[in-house]
């Protein structure tokens, strides 16, 4: 019996087609992805093949103005339109709190939403009961397939699930649910979830009875053969893991941003054992036409976005200096504003010992593309912010050793004075440079804001200590020459859309007046 699994993950609000790098579509003839194009391909496969499941491994939420405006209603609407069969909860589904998940998505989705390792307690338990499930058995042709969900247990540090949801260890929570499916004589079981490729592989190895793992969170690109675009494969598709009980378990992920549709064909024997698995992600490029009815619906929903982008978010009573002449040479108040917003967006008081789990921000000055003049009545709009942060990136959470941070700050000024983008703006950090010293030895003082303290203060950076830092995904991926970050980071979790972070902060503050305050000094 053959099953076709179509899968997406980490779509992050890319409802419209995008450029090849998943930013805003500029030249339509070269654009990719989007739900209208995805629907065309899904329908083509559904017509051609008998047993098809369309699955999503989480993080539909967060990433473009679509989410900022529609807050998840767009996810439910278009996933319903595409007739998804199941979805696993990702960490970003909690970005607007539990209410922001329940109302727009859980109550509106016409497909099961899954996670076996999230347990509700207190008053939330009865409110959310039945709105998401640990697993679902789906009839497919003449057979049944069990789908069991999981979500990163780091979600409380990455999003806003509140205090009434407990995120358990994935493997511990999955095993009894898979065992239960076995008692129902379900012998074809897919683990669908959002904990990253390393955990996906562990689930394949450790959870008895799981036949296939469909994952997300780490934006992993797998491919067999010559890859069709810029993404470099982390391994073959499917990636085969040998389980502790000797089975070959295929593990898949489909990069991110709706650029690819994962396509996996599994052959099962009559006892539900996987005999063979093969496939590849399908690049959703312009050779695949956009479905006209879905495209018309997208255009209808778009109107509200255009109106939103010109509305006032808040006011500034000072000039927001985002000029290259400032931000690539010295501390600039636009850099301070953005870093303050990045830290504010990551306030999670999850432990009495810590006032927050993270206190530091770094931001490449070259990523700040425009100032905002206060003389336009002080008004700040989404449109203004899109000029400052035009690349559609995210502000991510990483863990780095102090020694890596020191290297990053040396890199920040290794060729100072040439208006290059690697000069770092900061938050929760005091750095002093001596430019008279040779490159690689210019950082003379580097103090960082403590987290395990009741009164935050600045202490010298410790080389062997592990620190959490918020930074643009561009830096986490080694951009602007920050190869040491990419090579040495100990953990990387993708965060919220950059413009969304700053716009939320400005809306919250209402009136802003960021200053240049001595975060970066030259001796």
């Amino acid at each position: 019996w053959e099953l076709t699994i179509l899968h997406t993950n980490d779509v992050h609000s890319r409802l419209e087609q995008t450029s090849e790098d998943s930013s805003k579509c500029v030249n339509a003839s070269r654009c990719m992805g989007g739900v209208a194009r995805l629907f065309t391909k899904v329908q083509q496969i559904r017509r051609a093949e008998p047993n098809v499941l369309l699955l999503d491994a989480g993080d539909q939420y967060q990433g473009t103005i679509w989410f900022t405006v529609y807050k998840g209603a767009e996810v439910a609407h278009f996933m319903n339109a595409l007739r998804y069969d199941a979805m696993a909860l990702g960490n970003h589904e909690f970005d607007n709190g539990v209410e922001g998940l329940i109302e727009p998505l859980l109550k509106e989705a016409k497909f099961p939403i899954l996670s076996a390792n999230i347990k509700a307690k207190g008053p939330l338990a009865s409110q959310i009961s039945g709105l998401y499930l640990p697993y679902k058995v789906l009839p497919v042709g003449d057979e049944v397939v069990g789908i069991v969900g999981y979500t990163s247990k780091e979600t409380p540090f990455l999003s806003n699930p509140g205090t009434n949801l407990v995120f358990e260890d994935e493997i511990t929570a999955l095993q009894p649910e898979v065992d239960k499916l076995k008692t129902l004589n379900v012998n074809k079981i897919i683990a669908l979830g959002h904990s990253g490729f390393e955990m996906d592989k562990l689930i394949a190895q450790k959870v008895r009875g799981v036949d296939v793992v469909v994952g997300g969170h780490s934006n992993t690109f797998l491919y067999t053969g010559n890859p069709p675009s810029k993404e470099v494969p982390a391994g073959k598709y499917p990636f085969i893991v040998t389980s502790d009980d000797g089975r070959k378990v295929p593990v898949v992920q489909a990069y991110a941003f709706g650029k690819y549709l994962g396509y996996l064909k599994i052959e099962f024997d009559e006892r539900g054992n996987v005999i063979s698995s093969h496939g590849n992600p399908i690049l959703l490029n312009s050779s695949i036409p956009e479905d006209p009815s879905i495209k018309a619906d997208i255009n209808k929903w778009r109107i509200k976005l255009d109106n939103y982008s010109t509305q006032e978010l808040g006011k500034t009573i000072v000039y927001l200096d985002g000029s290259s002449q400032s931000c690539r040479f010295r501390e600039c108040n636009m850099g301070n504003l953005i870093c303050d917003a990045m830290i504010n967006n990551n306030l999670r008081h999850t432990d009495e010992m810590f006032w927050n789990h993270v206190s530091m921000c770094i931001l490449n000055g070259g990523g700040i593309r425009s100032p905002i003049d206060e003389r336009n009545n002080g008004t700040i709009t989404w449109e203004n912010l899109a000029a400052v942060l035009p690349f559609g990136g995210t502000f991510d959470l990483v863990q780095l050793k102090g020694s890596t941070l020191k290297k990053a700050f040396e890199h920040s000024v290794h060729r100072y004075g040439q208006s290059t983008g690697e000069f770092l703006q900061v938050g929760g950090i005091h750095v002093v440079y001596d430019l008279s010293r040779k490159p690689g030895d210019r950082v003379v003082k580097l103090d960082v804001l403590c987290t395990k303290c009741r009164v935050p203060s600045y202490d010298p950076l410790k080389m062997d200590e592990v620190y959490k830092v918020i930074l643009p995904n561009f830096l986490a991926n080694g951009g602007d020459g920050f190869q040491m970050i990419k090579d040495e980071l100990l953990r990387h979790d993708s965060g919220d859309q950059d413009i969304n972070v700053v716009s939320t902060y400005i809306s919250k503050m209402k009136v802003i007046y960021p200053a240049v305050e001595g975060r970066i000094k030259f001796s």
Partner: antibody, heavy 119, light 107 residues
């Protein structure tokens, strides 16, 4: 609205067989299990087994395996339960009930069929 | 098989009383628990599933709680139509099993 309508009461001799029907309407017949639960006079409820009309898959309570047969006719949305080698302790009201394939609580019940086993 | 032990087997109460019925499983059932109400000569009626989820149309005076092996059905203010027999049922492990029932009678 969802309805499960069962066949009428039966009186059987020990050693005989009885076949009870359950006709479903008001929902997609092939996407839910039909369970059989019995209740002896003045006693509690006992689950006998279930059939999934979508693919004919059956799960049994081992206590009844070999004596109970469940079949389905999708053309008439009807499920049948046959119990053989009847004995006096099989005298009970037999209910059919609808349940999810994966979470077997029973949200709709038939009216019940009284089966009396007596010589 | 998982044994479901319900207590008390019967109780007498008055209209307006708060009534609590408990159900203990012989092993953990991971919150896969339902409660039913049955009146004489009628089929059982689903009240709650998943421990706490109220079936559509069931009055909010019925509520459920518990985890692991121990579960409770509470009727916050007993009404005349609530005099009946109540059963718990586990649906974690085949064969699905019911408690012995609790008969709620008029005092």
């Amino acid at each position: 609205q969802v309805q499960l309508v069962q066949s009428g009461a039966e009186v059987k001799k020990p050693g005989a067989s009885v076949k009870v029907s359950c006709k479903a309407s008001g929902y997609t017949f092939t996407t839910y299990n039909i369970h059989w639960v019995r209740q002896a006079p003045g006693q509690g409820l006992e689950w006998m087994g279930a059939i999934f009309p979508g693919n004919g898959h059956i799960s049994y309570n081992q206590k009844f395996k070999g004596r109970v047969t469940m079949t389905v006719d999708t053309s008439t949305s009807t499920v049948y339960m046959e119990l053989s080698s009847l004995r006096s302790e099989d005298t009970a009201v037999y209910y059919c009930a609808r349940g999810d394939y994966d979470e077997s609580y029973f949200d709709y019940w038939g009216q019940g069929t009284l089966v009396t086993v007596s010589s | 098989d998982i044994q479901m032990t319900q207590s008390p087997s019967s109780l007498s109460a008055s209209v307006g009383d708060r009534v609590t019925i408990t159900c203990k499983a012989s092993e953990g059932i991971y919150n896969r628990l339902a409660w039913y109400q049955q009146k004489p000569g009628k089929a059982p009626k689903l009240l709650l599933y998943g421990v706490i989820s109220l079936e559509t149309g069931v009055p909010s005076r019925f509520s459920g709680s518990g985890s692991g092996k121990d579960y409770t059905l509470t009727i916050s203010s007993l009404q005349p139509e609530d005099f009946a027999t109540y059963y718990c049922q586990q649906y974690w492990s085949i064969p699905w099993t019911f408690g012995g029932g609790t008969k709620v009678e008029i005092k």
